[in-house]
Each structure stands twice: as C-alpha cells, then as structure tokens.
C-alpha cells in the first residue's frame, strides 16, 4: 500500500497559490505525485506524475470554493487522495505593499504600491481585486516604542511637522475594511528629517 502525502497545505500569497505537501516514508523507491482540482464535479489534472512536492494552482478562479487533492504513486499503485478546500479571495495572504519615502525638510512624503498579482498578460494588483482596499501606515521615532497609526485616503501620504534632524521609521500594510482583514507589514523604512523650512518672522 502506498502511503498518502503528508502535511498537505496551501501556501497562497497575493494569489500565488502553491499546494505543498511532504513525501511519506516509502521503502520500495521514489514516489511521484498527482494533484488535481475539481471543476463541475470532475477532477482535472494540474500536476501529473511529478517528483516535486508542490503544485502551482495560481491560475484558479479567485472566487470559487475549490476542492484540490493530491496522491502519491509508485509503479501501478497509488495512495488515497488527500483533499483540501481553498477559496483564494478569502484565504490568500495579503503580502506587504511597496513604499517609496522621500524627505522634504520636516516632512516625509510616502507613496504606496499595492502588491502585484502575477498574470501572463496584464499588470494587476491586489487593489484591482478588493474593492475596499486601503492602507494602514504606522510610524515612530527611531529608538522609541510609541507607534502612531494612520489610514491614508489615497496611494500617498505626507507626515508633516515632524521634529527636525530626527529619524522616523515607517511601514505600511494592505487592509480590507469590509473583511476586517489585514495584510503583512512592509519592512520599516527609516529616514532622517532635515531642518524646519519655516522662516522666522
């Protein structure tokens, strides 16, 4: 009897949907694997007789409740199927947005870039998929624990009237208010303000 794949799980970030599993111990030789998806009550092959322990399901419709399954195979024998269910639009992890930061005197000017979705023909971002897409920004004075959060209205934000010659750190994440779902924070970007440009009267 061929043992089934172990620890079957979906690793999905920004709709890059990779079904992953581990090869079970099997004394007779090397196992291969077949992974399938369900479409209209018929299972269709996605990865056939692969020696890999993952299969790319990124092309699944983002909106379906999908049933995926994988089994191990050796010669003419095979294991039972291991099934998982997956709804990309609900289950995918929202990766960190990009962020550009520029210092202008005592202000930090930030521009945010929604994470890209891989597609052969178009440049789509997570913002195209989620209507309620917005950003959370948190910033703090470097070396302190107190953090301030803001929710920009647009793809850019300006932090004004900061202390001059002080290093501030900023990070951003995607947020979906209608789902109360937050994405991953970007890596902090730390920049030092310069002087206050206001001219004394």
């Amino acid at each position: 009897m061929v043992p089934p794949p172990e620890n079957v799980r979906m690793n999905s970030v920004n709709f890059k949907n990779i079904l992953q599993w581990e090869s079970p111990a099997f004394a007779k030789g090397n196992l291969t694997f077949t992974a399938q998806y369900l479409s209209y009550r018929i299972f269709q092959d996605k990865c056939m007789n692969t020696t890999l322990t993952e299969c790319d399901f990124s092309s699944l419709s983002k909106y379906g409740d999908h049933t995926l399954r994988v089994r191990a195979e050796f010669a003419d024998e095979h294991s039972d199927w291991v099934n998982i269910t997956f709804c990309p639009v609900d289950d995918t992890i929202i990766g960190p947005p990009g962020m550009q930061v520029e210092v202008l005197a005592d202000s930090l000017h930030m521009r945010f870039l929604a994470p890209k979705i891989e597609n052969e023909y178009e440049t789509w971002t997570m913002k195209n998929v989620y209507n309620s897409w917005t950003y959370n920004v948190q910033y703090w004075k470097n070396g302190t624990d107190e953090k301030f959060q803001i929710t920009p209205q647009y793809d850019f934000e300006v932090l004004r009237n900061l202390e001059p010659w002080t290093t501030y750190c900023v990070q951003v994440r995607g947020f979906l208010p209608d789902r109360n779902k937050a994405g991953e924070w970007s890596e902090p970007v730390c920049e030092q303000t310069t002087h206050d440009e206001t001219v004394p009267s």
Partner: nanobody
Framework: QVQLQESGGGSVQAGGSLRLSCAAS????????MGWFRQAPGKEREGVAT???????RYADSVKGRFTISKDNAKNTLYLQMNSLKPEDTAMYYC???????????????LGQGTQVTVSS
Amino acid sequence: QVQLQESGGGSVQAGGSLRLSCAASRYTYNSYCMGWFRQAPGKEREGVATIDSDGMTRYADSVKGRFTISKDNAKNTLYLQMNSLKPEDTAMYYCAADADCTIAAMTTNPLGQGTQVTVSS
C-alpha cells in the same frame, strides 16, 4: 453539467467583425472563469481567451490585440468581440467555464452546441 448557450456566429469577409455571446447560470458566472475555445475541422481545439469574475483576462497569442473578451454582470453573459478577422479564424466557437483560468483549461471542457464563424478572403 453546466449549461452554456452560445450565439452570434456568422459569415464575414476578412477584416470584418463579429460579436459572440454566451449565456450562463449565475453560479457559473460568479464562481468560475469563463472563456472561449474554438475548433476548426480536422484540427485540435484551441483556447482563445478567458476572464475571471473580476475582469482579469488572458488571450491566446493568435488573437491578442484583435479579440476582446468581456462580461455583462447584470445579464450573466459572456462576450467575445472579434475584430480584424482572418480566414484562419474560421472555426466552431465554444463557450466554456472552468475553475482554472488558463487558456488550456478551457479546451478540456465538454463541447456545447457552439456557434460557427466563417471568414472568407
């Protein structure tokens, strides 16, 4: 089995245009990728275009820039606008739905009634 109803085929001169339509059930329309594939006599099925529920599209290289796939959400209807038609576009065109949005996945679906497109030079 999913019910899809194609229409809009016909005969045109090279360089002409046609718009194909496909009516689908609401469940199919919202939960699956929709697409078109075609089959010319004696030839393999060829995927043409697909569209996900949010409007993300994919096109076969042979039709890119000439064909446009779109959806009318209110009518649960899929369209294929075909411009600058060529004689090699002559085929039976089929509407399809699949959980997978690739061009290739559409071609694995059962054949419906289809709609004939004939382009003469």
